[in-house]
Interface confidence: low
C-alpha cells in the first residue's frame, strides 16, 4: 500500500480550524493478524529524506496522536489529551485519516507528516508516510478561509516507505 496526500499546501488565516488529510492507497490487508497504526507529527524541510525528523505537534508527540486499528481497542491514552490541545485525529473505513487543528496560530505553520505502519504480528512491518505544508497567515493578506492546493499526481504517488 501507499499513502497519498490529496493536498500538499494548506493556507489558513489565524484563528481558523484546519483538517489535514492523508489517504491509504492500494490493497490493504484486513487480516486478523494485521494492525495499522496511523499518526501525525511535524518535520522540517531541507532534509535528505522528508519526514525523517519527528517533532511534536503543539507539544504532543506521535505517540499521543496515534490511531489504531485491528486487535482489541486498548484504553485511549491520547484522545482527551489531544482535545485539550485543540487537536483531533480521525480515520474512516475508506482509507482516509486526518488531523484537525483548532484555533490556528502562526506557530502552527510548518511541514506536517502522516505515518502509517502496517504490523503483521510476529512477522513484518511496513511503513509509509506523506507530507504537506501548513501556512498560517495573519493580516490583510490572509485568506478569509483555508485555501488548499492539490498535490500533483506525481507527488501523490511518489511516496517512499518510511
Amino acid at each position: 500500500f501507499k499513502v497519498a496526500t490529496p493536498y500538499s499546501l494548506y493556507v489558513c488565516p489565524e484563528g481558523q480550524n484546519v483538517t489535514l488529510t492523508c489517504r491509504l492507497l492500494g490493497p490493504v490487508d484486513k487480516g486478523h493478524d494485521v494492525t495499522f497504526y496511523k499518526t501525525w507529527y511535524r518535520s522540517s524541510r531541507g532534509e535528505v529524506q522528508t519526514c525523517s525528523e519527528r517533532r511534536p505537534i503543539r507539544n504532543l508527540t506521535f505517540q499521543d496522536l496515534h490511531l489504531h486499528h485491528g486487535g482489541h481497542q486498548a484504553a485511549n491514552t491520547s484522545h482527551d489529551l489531544a482535545q485539550r490541545h485543540g487537536l483531533e485525529s480521525a480515520s474512516d473505513h475508506h482509507g482516509n485519516f486526518s488531523i484537525t487543528m483548532r484555533n490556528l496560530t502562526l506557530l502552527d505553520s510548518g511541514l506536517y507528516c502522516c505515518l502509517v505502519v502496517e504490523i503483521r504480528h510476529h512477522h513484518s512491518e511496513h511503513r509509509v508516510h506523506g507530507a504537506m505544508e501548513l501556512q498560517v497567515q495573519t493580516g490583510k493578506d490572509a485568506p478569509s478561509n483555508c485555501v488548499v492546493y492539490p498535490s500533483s499526481s506525481q507527488d501523490s504517488e511518489n511516496i517512499t516507505a518510511a
Epitope: T35, Y37, T39, R54, T61, F62, Q63, H66, H68, G71, H72, Q73, A74, A75, N76, T77, H79, D80, L81, V117, I119, R120, H121, H122, H123, E125, R127
Partner: antibody, heavy 120, light 107 residues
Amino acid sequence: QVQLVQSGAEVKKPGSSVKVSCKASGGTFSSYAISWVRQAPGQGLEWMGGIIPIFGTANYAQKFQGRVTITADESTSTAYMELSSLRSEDTAVYYCARSSYGWSYEFDYWGQGTLVTVSS
Amino acid sequence: DIQMTQSPSSLSASVGDRVTITCRASQSIATNLNWYQQKPGKAPKLLIYAASSLQSGVPSRFSGSGSGTDFTLTISSLQPEDFATYYCQQNDDRPITFGQGTKVEIK
C-alpha cells in the same frame, strides 16, 4: 509468547552510571512502547520513561530528565536504560515493561527486574 | 503530574471475602486506568485495563469500575493466591503515575 529478559544485578558507586538491557523475544518488537519502571525497596512503582523502537525517540518523566537515557536497538530487539549520576536513593529494582497494544501505556509484559544497588 | 491515591494502604481479609480497593485521581482521567497485582520478588501483573476490561487470562472474580476520578477494584471472592499488593496506574497523560499500593494480607 512474548518474553522480556533483563541483564543481571549491578552494584555501583555514587556518581557513576548504570546501563540495564531488556531483550524481547516472541513478538513484534518495534511497534510497542517499552517503558522502564523502578521500585525502591519496600516502595511503590515509579515510571521513568518509555520508547517506541520504531521511532527511536523516548519520553521521560520530568524527575529523571537529564539523568536517564532510554534507547532501543531494533536489530537485536533490545531496549536499554542508562541512569547517570547515581545516588543511594537510586537503589531499586528496575523493570522494563511492554505496552499491551501498540503505543498505549498499560503494561502486560514485564521483565524479571534488575536490582541496582548504589553504595560506596 | 496526575496524583493517584489508593485506599486503604493495607487490609486484612479471609479467603472467600469480597474485597474492594479504591483509587482516586487528582484530575479526570476518563477511563484511562489500569490495575496490577504484585507478589513479593515478582514483577507486576496486569489485571484490568481501561478501568473495567479484564486482561486475558485473569480470573473473572476480579473486576474494575469507575471513570473520571474515582475507580474501584473488586475481588468478589478472595482466593489464597490473591494475597498480594495491588496498584492502580493512570495512562491518560505523561508522566505515567501509579498509586502507592494496597497490601492485601491474610486475616
